[in-house]
């Protein structure tokens, strides 16, 4: 029995060739920016801002691009191994509990509190209480994975074993 | 078409040993991982063991290690499942799938009918 | 492990009306802008059949009155518009942490 793949388990030269069309899978897989092709012999590249594939995989296909909405701005462009990073336009924010739209920041604290944080693309404006300084019900934490990291070519979501 | 056709299934004693196989048709069998999940009568689903393309990675979970042996012979196109040391909370229906690969194993493609382990005495 | 919540653990709704199935995750199942989260339809007597994969791509074959959202621990699962061979139980599966892991399923009925 031995541990699920990893990046570092293949060969170096099956690593990311960007420029190549195709490559051949290694053991069964594709690096990312690819797809293998339906007879499972060769890695199709992804089409740039058209499709994208982040991990190694043996998908058919690569994953559609995300599209930013109307009240959205993109932040950084689909690549072949990278998604489409979009994020809430100033004065919105991205709530966690409805990630798929964004709401406009409230413009004030209600009477009695005091602002202490302002309206970020993942945040609303944060009030506390003058005298006891709790937080507002109404007050929505930051995600912790921001938008703003990058994760390069990642070969598995986390290290697994068998 | 995808085909994943399951047999080996049926009636056995606690600590007894069964043998499952799956032929598999309509895919390049040798560039894919395949996988056993089961589902007990009325209940949820299971992942039961993986193995990929070559036979060189396999997974288990804690509730079969040590019991169950996930198998491929790709000239066949076949998976197979040894069983031992079976135990009453081991029936269920075993399905065999094609189990797609995205940065580790990911999600269940296609699923055969299933065969059905009943352990009991 | 991660631990799937679904609910509500069945639900009836009529003919054409949207159903809404929500699945909750004991940890996050995001990373590099992915969700590892999968949906699948179960009809009696049928082996599953996968719907949704990273959390809102649909599967070739499938309706497009299903669709999929949600991110870190919170997903949903939508039928836009129930239809009579929609009646099913319906699974969430993450894929970001070994063991894989399936939800305990929510049973659609026609109201």
């Known amino acids: 029995e031995s541990a699920l793949i990893t990046q570092q388990d293949l060969a170096p030269q099956q690593r990311a060739a960007p420029q190549q069309k195709r490559s051949s899978p290694s053991e069964g897989l594709c690096p990312p920016g690819h797809h293998i092709s339906e007879d499972g012999r060769d890695c199709i590249s992804c089409k740039y801002g058209q499709d994208y594939s982040t991990h190694w995989n043996d998908l058919l296909f690569c994953l559609r691009c995300t599209r930013c909405d109307s009240g959205e701005v993109e932040l950084s462009p689909c690549t072949t191994t990278r998604n489409t990073v979009c994020q809430c336009e100033e004065g919105t924010f991205r709530e966690e509990d409805s990630p798929e739209m964004c709401r406009k920041c409230r413009t004030g604290c209600p009477r009695g509190m005091v602002k202490v944080g302002d309206c970020t693309p993942w945040s609303d404006i944060e009030c506390v209480h003058k005298e006891s300084g709790t937080k507002h019900s109404g007050e929505v934490p930051a995600v912790e994975e921001t938008v703003t990291s990058s994760p390069g070519t990642p070969a598995s979501p986390c290290s697994l074993s068998g | 078409e995808v085909q994943l056709v399951e047999s080996g299934g049926g009636l056995v004693q606690p600590g007894g040993s069964l043998r499952l196989s799956c032929a598999a048709s309509?895919?390049?069998?040798?560039?894919?991982?395949m996988s056993w999940v089961r589902q007990a009568p009325g209940k949820g689903l299971e992942l039961v063991a993986a193995i990929n393309s070559n036979g060189g990675r396999i997974h288990y979970p804690d509730t079969v290690k040590g019991r169950f042996t996930i198998s491929r012979d790709n000239a066949k196109n076949s998976l197979y499942l040894q069983m031992n040391s079976l135990r009453a909370e081991d029936t269920a229906v075993y399905y065999c799938?094609?189990?797609?690969?995205?940065?580790?194993?990911?999600?269940?493609?296609?699923w055969g009918q299933g065969t059905l382990v009943t352990v009991s005495s | 492990d991660i631990v799937l919540t679904q609910s509500p653990d069945s639900l009836a709704v009529s003919l054409g009306e949207r159903a809404t199935i929500n699945c909750r995750a004991s940890?996050?199942?995001?990373?590099?802008?992915?969700?590892?989260m999968h949906w699948y339809q179960q009809k009696p007597g049928q082996p599953p059949k996968l719907l949704i994969y990273?959390?809102?791509n649909l599967e070739s074959g499938v309706p497009d009155r299903f669709s999929g959202s949600g991110s870190r621990t919170d997903f949903t699962l939508t039928i836009s518009s129930l239809q009579a061979e929609d009646v099913a139980v319906y699974y969430c599966?993450?894929?970001?942490?070994?063991?894989?892991?399936f939800g305990g399923g929510t049973k659609v009925e026609i109201k």
């Open positions: 990273l959390s809102s």
């Open positions: 799938t094609r189990l797609t690969y995205y940065g580790n194993p990911a999600w269940f493609a296609y």
């Open positions: 309509g895919l390049p069998f040798n560039s894919y991982y």
């Open positions: 599966q993450q894929s970001y942490e070994d063991p894989l892991t």
């Open positions: 940890e996050s199942v995001d990373i590099y802008g992915n969700s590892f």
